[in-house]
Amino acid sequence: LDLSNVQSKCGSKDNIKHVPGGGSVQIVYK
């Protein structure tokens, strides 16, 4: 899955909360 063009708005995935789907996402993680 090539998501190299996705704009990341955070430094890492370390503090991603497990949400039930894309509808709960505030930003798109890289």
Epitope: L3, H18, P20, G21, G22, G23, V25, Q26, V28
Partner: antibody
Framework: QVQLVQSGAEVKKPGSSVKVSCKAS????????ISWVRQAPGQGLEWMGE????????YYNEKFKGRVTITADKSTSTAYMELSSLRSEDTAVYYC?????????????WGQGTLVTVSS | DIVMTQSPLSLPVTPGEPASISCKSS????????????LAWYLQKPGQSPQLLIY???TRESGVPDRFTGSGSGTDFTLKISRVEAEDVGVYYC????????FGQGTKVEIK
């Protein structure tokens, strides 16, 4: 390369339980959700639930709540799906899939499937 | 629960001709904050595990031929194959991941 390798076929009696494993390799196990999807013979795909290995947090399809338990062992990069109180309608191929959590929420890699047959 | 409805359920096609599959959701799959539709398309070829074709409604997965195009937003989505090839036969599923996950019933594409 990313691989999801599932355990072998199982034959179970009605009322018993089955535990299917899914060993991941080729990526950081904790960074992706693992989803479980089943497919009864000649039928479509049905999502059962998922786990985020980093936290152990799970979500389940309401249809299976109370009967399915999904777990993950970070030390071996293995996810497990246990289904209890088996009935004949649970005869299906069970797939694990890597879910690109936090981005596309799409299942980009799938295991080979595990056939579970429930028969007396 | 979000319900996904595909049509048609069976689609006989002629090689070289176009094909189109519709997928409708019972509620919008568009996240206004990320501006993404959480809708994916999968193909399950006979005897194989499903494979990802399209995510975010219209983004082609790496390695997927450009004859496959996903479109739509909100509740109405379409997968188009510009020129069907023999290797495209199988069952196509749409899937929402806006809230949990739900698959459509599947559309069986077969050569006439």
């Amino acid at each position: 390369q990313v691989q999801l390798v599932q355990s072998g076929a199982e034959v179970k009696k009605p009322g018993s339980s089955v535990k299917v494993s899914c060993k991941a390799s080729g990526y950081t196990f904790s960074d992706y959700v693992i989803s479980w999807v089943r497919q009864a013979p000649g039928q479509g795909l049905e999502w059962m639930g998922e786990i985020f290995p980093r936290s152990g947090s799970t979500y389940y399809n309401e249809k299976f709540k109370g009967r399915v338990t999904i777990t993950a062992d970070k030390s071996t990069s293995t996810a497990y799906m246990e289904l209890s109180s088996l009935r004949s309608e649970d005869t299906a191929v069970y797939y694990c899939a890597r879910d690109y959590y936090g981005t596309s929420f799409a299942m980009d890699y799938w295991g080979q499937g595990t056939l579970v047959t429930v028969s007396s | 629960d979000i319900v996904m409805t595909q049509s048609p359920l069976s689609l006989p096609v002629t090689p070289g001709e176009p094909a189109s599959i519709s997928c409708k959701s019972s509620q919008s799959l568009l996240n206004s904050r990320t501006r993404k539709n959480y809708l994916a398309w999968y193909l399950q070829k006979p005897g194989q595990s499903p494979q990802l074709l399209i995510y975010w409604a219209s983004t082609r997965e790496s390695g997927v031929p450009d004859r496959f195009t996903g479109s739509g937003s909100g509740t109405d989505f379409t997968l188009k194959i510009s020129r069907v090839e023999a290797e495209d036969v199988g069952v196509y599923y749409c899937k929402q991941s806006f809230y949990l996950r739900t698959f459509g019933q599947g559309t069986k594409v077969e050569i006439k």
